[in-house]
């Protein structure tokens, strides 16, 4: 799967949320980044993610499609110079400063089965998504499209009207 | 070469039912939302519904919500639209149209030529 | 349900001018938009998607912008085959088109 562009197709900030409604949040401890998810209190502010669209090609041996073959990436950077990444040995979704070309561990396959969520699937371990374990972030193995469904792979973007990124 | 070639479309009375498939070629149809979408004579498009890849969601206008059913077959690269309880105002050019990329809901990249519905006593 | 209104509905502009097609959403849309060209008798073509993004093929004249509720389809040089009705479409929530734009060459 080879990004077809360096530059992404589009940017814009989105609050990430689980599809129970929980908030996926980001904290500092010990100069490093922890990922939670968890209940916002009524008036809590959402954190917010920049989620960065790229356009990226089918391998030829795997779509039929040709120039046709496209589907997207996207990389999800919560606070400047940080993005989500997969830990494909540990089966963890965690936060590490990059700089640009960013990894392919930072890149995920975007997929949407229902209209309102989204799933991300690691570009370096195709049929494992971000999932929902346990409180935290992982990386959970789909070994059929018919779990694609299952809802702690399944996310939902809310838009936000704030246009900084932190 | 992508393809999407609609048929079913007819003269047909209110209330009657119409079935109509759109056979798709050129790429891998199992990876793409697909869609009816609909145009009235000398009017604008309408989105009618979607269908996810694997056939498991799917949505539709408030207004065939309940007569319209949309379903798709990956074997043999056909999706649907079975239309019933039909209605002067369904009168329109159907087009059926896939997804710009694999997994997503975004944008339709490709579109057939249509197949007209005529509904009228 | 997000509405798109367009505006004008119809634009008249000469061979060799600058138009521009607007569009407008209800709500926030993410960038999430679509501009659609569809010729008389022919079925639409994706022309512009996620609000700038040329279609392969489609001419360099051809350009989007835009972000939020407000956007815009600019043709820097209108030619005669660019006579067709033009259809914003958002796909943040839900899926709909605006009613269309007709251009005609004066």
């Known amino acids: 799967m080879s990004i077809t562009g360096i530059s992404p197709i589009t940017e814009y900030l989105a609050s990430l949320s689980t599809y129970n409604d929980q908030s996926i949040t980001f904290a500092l401890e010990d100069e490093s980044y922890e990922i939670y998810v968890e209940d916002l209190k009524k008036d809590e502010k959402k954190d917010k993610v920049l989620l960065s669209y790229y356009e990226s090609q089918h391998p030829s041996n795997e779509s039929g499609d040709g120039v046709d073959g496209k589907m997207l990436m996207v990389t999800l950077s919560p606070t400047k110079d940080f993005w989500l990444h997969a830990n494909n040995k540990e089966h963890s979704v965690e936060l590490h400063k990059s700089e640009k070309p960013l990894p392919d561990q930072a890149f995920f396959v975007l997929h949407n089965m229902h209209s309102n969520s989204v799933s991300f699937e690691s570009k370096t371990d195709p049929g494992v998504f971000i999932g929902v374990k346990d409180n935290h972030l992982a990386l959970i193995k789909v070994d059929s499209s018919e779990n694609l469904s299952t809802e702690n792979i399944l996310f939902k973007l809310s838009e936000t009207h704030h246009h900084h990124h932190h | 070469e992508v393809q999407l070639v609609e048929t079913g479309g007819g003269l047909v009375q209110p209330g009657r039912s119409l079935k109509l498939s759109c056979v798709a070629s050129g790429f891998t149809f199992s990876n793409y939302w697909m869609y009816w979408i609909r145009q009235a004579p000398g009017m604008g498009l309408e989105w009618v519904s979607s269908i996810n890849n694997d056939g498991g969601n799917t949505y539709y206008l408030d207004s065939v919500k309940g007569r319209f059913t949309i379903s798709r077959n990956n074997a043999e690269n056909t999706v649907y639209l079975q239309m019933n309880s039909l209605r002067s105002e369904d009168t329109a050019t159907y087009y059926c149209?896939?997804?710009?990329?694999?997994?997503?809901?975004?944008?339709?990249?490709?579109w057939g030529q249509g197949t007209l519905v005529t509904v009228s006593s | 349900d997000i509405q798109m209104t367009q505006s004008p509905s119809v634009l008249s502009a000469s061979v060799g001018d600058r138009v521009t097609l607007s569009c407008k959403a209800s709500h926030n849309i993410n960038k999430h938009l679509d501009w659609y060209q569809q010729k008389v008798g022919e079925a639409p073509k994706l022309l512009i998607y996620f609000t700038n993004n040329l279609q392969t093929g489609i001419p360099s004249r051809f350009s989007g912008s835009g972000s939020g509720t407000d956007y815009t389809l600019t043709i820097s040089s209108l030619q005669p085959e660019d006579v067709a009705t033009y259809f914003c479409?958002?796909?943040?929530?839900?899926?709909?088109f605006g009613q269309g734009t007709k251009v005609e060459i004066k």
């Open positions: 149209a896939k997804g710009h990329y694999s997994y997503t809901s975004y944008s339709f990249g490709y």
């Open positions: 479409f958002q796909y943040n929530s839900g899926w709909t």
